[in-house]
Structures are given as C-alpha cells and as structure tokens.
C-alpha cells in the first residue's frame, strides 16, 4: 500500500488516551523518549500529539474511478522531529527521531470500530495494532475483525484548541 501524496491531507493536535481514560504521556529520559500509560492527577496537563493524516491506495483489483480503495494512514508526533514507530521485531512502540520522508514504521492505518475511538494498525505488519500492555504501549496481534473492538487497542482522541506543535 503506497502513500498517494507526500503531504498530509490534514493535521491536528490531540491528546491520546486509552479506552479506559488513562493518558498516553511522553517523557525525556537519558536523551531518549519513554512512553507511559498512566492516570493523570486532576489538573495535570495532558500531552499533545500531532496527528498527520495521509491517503494511501489499498492494493486491490477493484474497478472504479480511483476513489474506492483508499485508506487513511496516520503518523503520530508528540514533539518536534520525533514520531511513534512500530518495532515489529520487539513487538514494541518506540519514539524515534526521524527526517522526512518518514520510514514505513512510522505509518499506521487508521481504524475506528466505534464512533468515538480509533485504532492504529502497523503499516509494516498488517493485523498488528498499537495496544496497551503492562502500562506501556506495545504491538498486539489482532486475529479477526471481531477483535477490533478489544478495548486494549482502542484509543480516544481529545481535541485541543491549540494549533502549535510543542
């Protein structure tokens, strides 16, 4: 599946939380970023993530005018020049510094099996989704469409009214 344009079709800032309302947070430790899944204190500020949406052509033999067969890919960047990456060998989700064009490991196919939550499928390993395991993000294999509603791969995007990427 190939990205159909080098520019995102839209971008916006949002805070990311689990289906159970735990926050996804990012902390700089020893010159690298760690990703945590945690309960925030009442007035603690949520970390923001820049979501960039790209169109991608799904590999298929479908006929039509080119409109059908598109999917949405997203990249997630919590801070400048750093993006979430799928490490398929380690089944882990990591923050890495990258330059554009971003590697395929930084792209995730967007799903929403609920109207108010989304899931992120690894572009480089179809059927594998970002999920929550032991208070960390991990890559989790989903073996059927019924399991797309499994809560540990569902995330909520809370909008923010700020437009600047910190």
């Amino acid at each position: 599946m190939s990205i159909t344009g080098i520019s995102p079709i839209t971008e916006y800032l949002a805070s990311l939380s689990t289906y159970n309302d735990q926050s996804i947070t990012f902390a700089l430790e020893d010159e690298s970023y760690e990703i945590y899944v945690e309960d925030l204190k009442k007035d603690e500020k949520k970390d923001k993530v820049l979501l960039s949406y790209y169109e991608s052509q799904h590999p298929s033999n479908e006929s039509g005018d080119g409109v059908d067969g598109k999917m949405l890919m997203v990249t997630l960047s919590p801070t400048k020049d750093f993006w979430l990456h799928a490490n398929n060998k380690e089944h882990s989700v990591e923050l890495h510094k990258s330059e554009k064009p971003l590697p395929d490991q930084a792209f995730f196919v967007l799903h929403n099996m609920h109207s108010n939550s989304v899931s992120f499928e690894s572009k480089t390993d179809p059927g594998v989704f970002i999920g929550v395991k032991d208070n960390h993000l991990a890559l989790i294999k989903v073996d059927s469409s019924e399991n797309l509603s499994t809560e540990n791969i569902l995330f909520k995007l809370s909008e923010t009214h700020h437009h600047h990427h910190h």
Partner: antibody, heavy 121, light 106 residues
Framework: EVQLVETGGGLVQPGRSLKLSCKTS????????MYWIRQAPGKGLEWVSS????????YYPDSVKGRFTISRDNAENTIYLQMSSLRSEDTATYFC??????????????WGQGSLVTVSS | EIQMTQSPSVLSASVGDRVTLSCKAS??????LDWYQQKLGEAPKLLIY???NLQTGIPSRFSGSGSGTDCTLTINSLQPGDVATYFC????????FGGGTKLELD
C-alpha cells in the same frame, strides 16, 4: 464501478413496519462503514444510522433510536434498515451511502439513488 | 450533539461570479467536515472532504477552507451546472448535516 441500489420503499400506514435493503457492488464491502441518510420532501439531509465494517457497532440519532435497526450481510454485500412504529415524520427518501475510506467513519464517498418511504393512512 | 448552521439558506448569483457558502459548527470539529452537492432529483455527491480536499473528478473551481468551528465552500467562476443545494457535514463527533444552501442563478 461502485453501485448502491436501495429497494423496499413504498406506502405504509402509521405504526407499521418496513424494511429497506441496499445492495452494493464494485468495492470491498466488508471493509467499509455504511450509512442510511434520509431527506423529507423539500427538506435537508438527516443522518439516520451508521454501522461498522464488521457490523459489531451501530449508531442512531434520538429521532429514530429504538424504532430503526441497521444491519448488514457481508456475504451478500447488503445493508438493511428495519423501520418500525413508523410516523408521518418518517416520510422521506432514504439513501444508503458508503464510507470514503477503508475502516473509518469519515466522509460519505458514494450514495445510492434513494428509496421513497411514505407514511400515511 | 454538534449543530451545523449554514448561511445563507438561499443564494442568488450570476455566471462567472465567485460564490462563498458558510458553515458554522457549535464546537470545534478539527477539520472533520465535508461538502456535498445535490442537484434536483439526484443523490448528493461528495465535493470536498476533510475541509479542503477536492474529491476526485470535481472541478478545481470548487475549494474548501476553514478550521475550528468555521468552514467555507468557495466556487470560483460559477457555472450554470453548479445550480444545486450544498450541504456541509461533520464527522468529528457523531454525524450531522447543515441545513443546506440553495444556490440559484440570477
């Protein structure tokens, strides 16, 4: 070529039931959200129902909740709208539509031509 | 529930005019907004998605813009074939249509 064809509309008395079908072709049906939207004569568009690709989740506005049921048959590439306890205000042309993208509920990429439902005694 | 308000409800313009249609959401919709064109007796057709992306096959005289709660559809150099009703549609939180703007020729 993507096609969506609605059938099952007609004249029905208040309080009765009716089932609409939307047969589709030309795309990977089981990967798309599907929708019903209606339009009363001379009025605007109103979203009526949505269903996820695997049929596991369905959504309705308050105006039809508890009376209308959306369902899908991924083997037959068809969605349905079961309407019960029909009221005069349900009189409308009912359109089915498919999502614009695989797997997501964003945008209505294609629409059928619609099926007219008239609720009157 | 997010409310979508379109203005004006009816707009008269001449061939060649630059026409602007407005859509206002009751809360931030994060660019999750489409524009649909419906000609008399026809099904609606997707023109613009995610606020400013032109659907395949739609003439480039159509464009969309906006962010937050305010979005705009612009038609540069209006053509006779553009006579229709235009609806905005949000999918940021549930699904809601605006009431429509009927575009007529003077």
């Amino acid at each position: 070529e993507v096609q969506l064809v609605e059938t099952g509309g007609g004249l029905v008395q208040p309080g009765r039931s009716l089932k609409l079908s939307c047969k589709t072709s030309g795309f990977t049906f089981s990967s798309y959200w599907m929708y019903w939207i209606r339009q009363a004569p001379g009025k605007g568009l109103e979203w009526v129902s949505s269903i996820t690709p695997n049929g596991g989740n369905t959504y309705y506005p308050d105006s039809v909740k508890g009376r209308f049921t959306i369902s899908r048959d991924n083997a037959e590439n068809t969605i349905y709208l079961q309407m019960s306890s029909l009221r005069s205000e349900d009189t409308a042309t009912y359109f089915c539509a498919k999502g614009h993208y695989y797997y997501t509920s964003y945008s209505l990429g294609y629409w059928g031509q619609g099926s007219l439902v008239t609720v009157s005694s | 529930e997010i409310q979508m308000t379109q203005s004006p409800s009816v707009l008269s313009a001449s061939v060649g005019d630059r026409v602007t249609l407005s859509c206002k959401a009751s809360q931030n919709i994060n660019k999750h907004l489409d524009w649909y064109q419906q000609k008399l007796g026809e099904a609606p057709k997707l023109l613009i998605y995610f606020t400013n992306n032109l659907q395949t096959g739609i003439p480039s005289r159509f464009s969309g813009s906006g962010s937050g709660t305010d979005c705009t559809l612009t038609i540069n150099s209006l053509q006779p074939g553009d006579v229709a009703t235009y609806f905005c549609f949000q999918y940021n939180n549930g699904w809601t249509f605006g009431g429509g703007t009927k575009l007529e020729l003077d």
